[in-house]
């Protein structure tokens, strides 16, 4: 009796896992073995498959083949036994076309109000991904194990915190790999989960920001308690997206270690040109709070994205506030030659009520004031471009009375 | 593969000071920072302080602060600690340690017996 | 500086038995706990890190558990090269910190 050829083959790249499946076409033939050959673009002879000879079974693996990744192949299947049937050719394939990026390899590490999350390619030092080992970038999917609402978080790099998280609560994660220039989104990870440790007795420090004046950076933060002692740390923000790097050094900036404020001073030639993640943590002498949340501080937005200057004209039940560049050390005006969007905010000053106002324009209306009250006025820049998605602090407020009634025109 | 390899065990006299070494093997100390750790006999290990050999940044424990001084040199891929004004409450194992981020000390040196005795 | 805290000196055990060996710290440290076991003449060896996540080569019977200031060891059916000290350590801030040690003895 003619043997059948196999039919259906199916070829499964996983990182560097090359797995090959295919149907029986005869299930009542026992006792028959299958054999793949190979064939690379511009070759006219055909060679054995290593790992792919004799299979009794209807898969087998050829990861050991080394091959070109990026170049065409063509394989062929036959069945045997005391005869053999045809070949059966399978349509030819890039493996780097057809690959699949794996699971990626998971590692938590539990805060009372944080996790941090060490993520790296499934397979080391992969063939595959190779040129591209730079390049992945990961997203996750995280809940509350008790609730199962799930939040996604998108475009994230080998070391991820996530914060504002609940204490002593187990919370779950999964996490996959993507190659967004070849279009490639992997597979998701294992489900791993942790639970948040008891609430430390320090909080981190909070809303820290950077500032510029003169030549020095003005780091400021808010802080619970008083008596307290501060360090500062730094870290170029690339090595965050280094997937073989789990050690992340940070370094301390010498004029804010153990300060007594909540805010410190450095000069700007501390830093090169470039973008690092800045952190805060608190002592009081016994005890130390965990790292605050890392702010991201790039030196060229920071050096030119100072707070507005503005002028407040008072009528009856109005400020017409003109805002202008804002002025260096020496007085002269800095240009800013990119779109920016400012955030005015204003108070009655004997009230905390805040109210505020956003307009792109240079001079704008705040309306609706009562007559001859003192209003408090503070503006902040943004920078309207999603890349350099950076604020000023605010400037100064300026406290002005209204007019008597009727002075509106 | 991995592996640290310490210098030989010494004996020497109260007073004086002495650099051991630990020379790395099968990674580049420049990625790593490498600890230095103390241990006494029937004793618990202690910390002692560790260097950032990329740019030489070190870090020390109280105790140890004005005793001990931690320096590499990357050429040899070598981190080396030295201690002065030896006692015998300075006789002990030192080992040095590779620390690797969330993994910690990943790998040991086999330790340099110490031995302050006059 | 963070204390850990090995409350037991001396933990007697059998071949076959489960044993817990526990750490205390002082202050909350997150995850960042080792556990290394050391034989008599020999540099340690590191078991778990991030208190729970076994290093390659450990043999399963070692699992970590534990976060915030407890940790715990376990050794289930214990071996006779399991019989050793073991260590807790710290490093989730600086001065890193070590507990005193738990040997482990046939009864």
């Known amino acids: 009796k003619n043997l059948k050829s196999p039919q259906k083959v199916e070829v499964d790249i996983i990182d560097d896992n090359f797995i090959l499946r295919w149907n029986r076409s005869d299930e009542s033939v026992g006792n028959v073995t299958f054999s793949f050959d190979y064939q690379k673009t511009g070759m006219d002879n055909w060679i054995k498959l290593s790992g792919c000879q004799n299979i009794t079974s209807t898969k087998c693996n050829f990861s050991s083949l080394k091959l070109n990744v990026y170049e065409e192949i063509k394989l062929r299947i036959r069945a045997e036994k005391e005869n053999t049937s045809s070949w059966y050719e399978v349509d030819s394939f890039t493996p780097f076309r057809k690959a699949q990026i794996g699971p990626p390899e998971v590692h938590l590490e539990a805060e009372d109000k944080a996790i941090v999350i060490h993520i790296s390619p499934g397979t080391k030092d992969s063939v595959m991904w190779a040129l591209d080992g730079l390049s992945f970038t990961y997203s996750l999917v995280i809940w509350k194990n008790s609730s199962g609402v799930e939040e996604r978080i998108e475009n994230i790099y080998s070391r991820h915190k996530i914060y504002k998280l609940s204490p002593e609560t187990t919370y779950c994660l999964k996490v996959k790999a993507a190659l967004l220039t070849s279009w490639k989104i992997g597979v998701y990870s294992p489900v791993h989960c942790i639970k948040t440790t008891v609430e430390n007795e320090l909080p981190p420090p909070e809303n820290i920001e950077v500032s510029v004046q003169n030549q020095n950076y003005v780091l400021k933060w808010d802080y619970t308690y008083a008596n307290m002692t501060f360090q500062v740390q730094w870290l170029h923000a690339f090595l965050k997206r280094n997937p073989g790097n789990h050690l992340y050094k940070w370094k301390q900036i010498p004029d804010c270690e153990n300060v007594k404020t909540t805010q410190c001073v450095f000069p700007q030639n501390v830093f090169q040109k470039g973008i690092y993640l800045l952190r805060v943590q608190a002592s009081d002498g016994n005890n130390t709070s965990f790292w605050s949340e890392e702010i991201k501080f790039d030196t060229e937005i920071q050096a030119f994205l100072l707070p507005p200057v503005f002028n407040i004209r008072s009528l009856s039940d109005s400020f017409h506030i003109y805002i202008g560049a804002p002025k260096q050390s020496g007085n002269t005006p800095v240009i800013q030659d990119y779109p920016l969007i400012y955030e005015i905010i204003f108070w009655e000053n004997t009230s905390n009520a805040e109210r505020k106002i956003i307009e792109k324009k240079t001079d704008v209306t705040v309306p609706n004031l009562k007559p001859l009250t003192v209003y408090c006025v503070k503006a902040r820049a943004h920078t309207m471009d999603e890349k350099l998605n950076k604020s000023s602090v605010f400037s100064d407020a300026v406290c002005e009375k209204t007019k008597p009634g009727n002075t509106s025109k | 593969e991995v592996h640290l390899q310490q210098s030989g065990a010494e004996l020497v006299k109260p007073g004086t000071s002495l650099k051991l070494s630990c020379t790395a093997s099968g990674f580049n100390i420049k990625d790593y920072y490498i600890h230095w750790v103390k241990q006494r006999t029937e004793q618990g290990l202690e910390w002692i302080g560790r260097?950032?050999?990329?740019?030489?940044?070190?870090k020390y424990a109280p105790t140890f602060q004005g005793k001990a001084t931690i320096t590499a040199d990357t050429s040899s891929n070598t981190a080396y600690l030295q201690l002065s004004s030896l006692t015998s409450e300075d006789t002990a194992v030192y080992y040095c340690?590779?620390?690797?981020?969330?993994?910690?000390?990943?790998?040991w040196g086999q330790g340099t017996t110490l031995t302050v005795s006059s | 500086d963070i204390v850990m805290t090995q409350s037991q000196k001396f933990m007697s055990t059998s071949e076959g038995d489960r044993v817990s060996v526990t750490c205390k710290a002082s202050q909350n440290v997150g995850t960042n706990v080792v556990w290394y076991q050391q034989k008599p003449g020999q540099s340690p060896k590191a078991l778990i890190y991030s208190a729970s996540y076994r290093y390659s080569g450990v043999p399963d019977r070692f699992t970590g558990s534990g976060s915030g200031t407890d940790f715990t060891l376990t050794i289930s059916n214990v071996q006779s090269e399991d019989l050793a000290e073991y260590f807790c350590q710290q490093y989730n801030r600086y001065p890193f910190t070590f507990g005193a040690g738990t040997k482990l003895e046939l009864k």
């Open positions: 340690a590779r620390y690797n981020g969330y993994s910690g000390f990943d790998y």
């Open positions: 260097i950032d050999p990329e740019d030489g940044e070190t």
